[in-house]
Interface confidence: low
């Protein structure tokens, strides 16, 4: 079990990494999405694994990106930022985020409305229970 | 961004203390918020920290017991409470903030403790 | 807990001097490392994340570089604001730990 979870945590690291790098392979970055969508996490062990990933990262004045699956819609209650950003694009994981063919990104606002925890936790225990 | 830290403190041993940590300049509950402590001469050591958000905290084994970290988003102010103080305890406090490593510090809060 | 091993615990150098400081984990923390700089009276200043990635307003001369177990931090050419205390510290599984700094003086 120690040896699959530190399979798995290279795996997402390697996905974080080159995140939105090749439209024609997002099969893991799908994947991904799916995960934190459903677990309501964000990164490996922090949000902030994200703001690292070069496509992702804005210049000093802009707000971080992170992939629109860590929003946490029941603590946004801006219904601009549901309505235009957010809600159009996560309501493709519900699909099992199977139609995407670009990674889907959203800017970090000032009150960061994203899942504050990684996903670390929560797959580790799903690993143990299963 | 800036962290302002209550004043130093002298306290008895078996006493708690109570340092706050006063954050401007960016949204409180976009952080977390940390509490790192350097003893006199010595290396720095991480005592937890809290998500003032949703008001969850991680603490350092070493420490957990005897250290409460609070927030009162309100004043935008992190606590952090130290209980049965010891002569080892003497050490300079700091708050930082974080989402992963820690960016912004504030400028420390001397605890002495001596009978 | 997971131990840092820094290294040296002290040097002396010259204005002008490349400086390296090396950091080693007892176990693989990725690239969840940063690095600080203090200086006496005063609070730790973030210069590195994530192993590589320079903090803002951070001179260019620093540089931070490894992943996994071992890292470094370069000095490109040492500028007399750079004498201070240099530590590292993880930031992947809780309890964060720090190194116990380096020290760089003036030759």
């Known amino acids: 079990r120690a040896q699959l979870e530190r399979s798995l945590r290279d795996v997402v690291e390697k996905t974080i990494q080159k995140y939105g790098t090749n439209p024609e392979e997002t099969a893991a970055e799908e994947s991904w999405d799916y995960v934190q969508f459903q677990l309501r996490c964000c990164g490996w062990h922090y949000p902030q694994d994200w703001f690292q990933v070069l496509i992702l990262r804005g210049n000093g004045s802009e707000a971080h990106r992170v992939p629109c699956s860590c929003y946490n819609l029941s603590a946004t209650n801006d219904s601009t930022i549901l309505d235009k950003v957010i809600l159009p694009q996560l309501s493709r994981l519900g699909h099992l985020a199977r139609s995407r063919h670009s990674a889907d990104i959203c800017a970090v606002p000032a009150e960061s409305h994203i899942y504050r925890e990684g996903c670390a936790q929560g797959l580790q225990k799903w690993l143990h229970n299963n | 961004v800036q962290l302002v830290q209550s004043g130093a403190e002298v306290k008895k041993p078996g006493s708690s203390v109570k340092v706050s940590c006063k954050a401007s300049g960016y949204s409180f509950t976009g952080y977390n918020m940390n509490w790192v402590r350097q003893a006199p001469g010595q290396g720095l050591e991480w005592m937890g920290n809290i998500d003032p958000y949703y008001g969850g905290t991680t603490y350092n084994r070493k420490f957990k017991g005897r250290v409460t970290l609070t927030v009162d988003k309100s004043s935008s102010t992190a606590y952090m409470e130290l209980s049965s103080l010891r002569s080892e305890d003497t050490a300079v406090y700091y708050c930082?903030?974080?989402?992963?490593?820690?960016?912004?510090w504030g400028q420390g809060t001397l605890v002495t403790v001596s009978s | 807990d997971i131990q840092m091993t820094q290294s040296p615990s002290s040097l002396s150098a010259s204005v002008g001097d490349r400086v390296t400081i090396t950091c080693r984990t007892s176990?693989?923390?990725?690239?969840?490392l940063a690095w600080y700089q203090q200086k006496p009276g005063k609070a730790p200043k973030l210069l590195v994340s994530?192993?590589?990635t320079l903090a803002e307003g951070v001179p260019s001369r620093f540089s931070g570089s490894g992943s996994g177990t071992d890292f470094t931090l370069t000095i490109s050419s040492l500028q007399p604001e750079d004498f201070a205390t240099y530590f590292c510290?993880?930031?992947?599984?809780?309890?964060?730990?720090f190194g116990q700094g380096t020290k760089v003086e003036i030759k």
């Open positions: 994530s192993a590589k």
């Open positions: 510290q993880h930031h992947s599984d809780n309890p964060w730990t």
């Open positions: 930082a903030r974080s989402v992963g490593p820690m960016d912004y």
């Open positions: 176990e693989n923390v990725y690239s969840y």
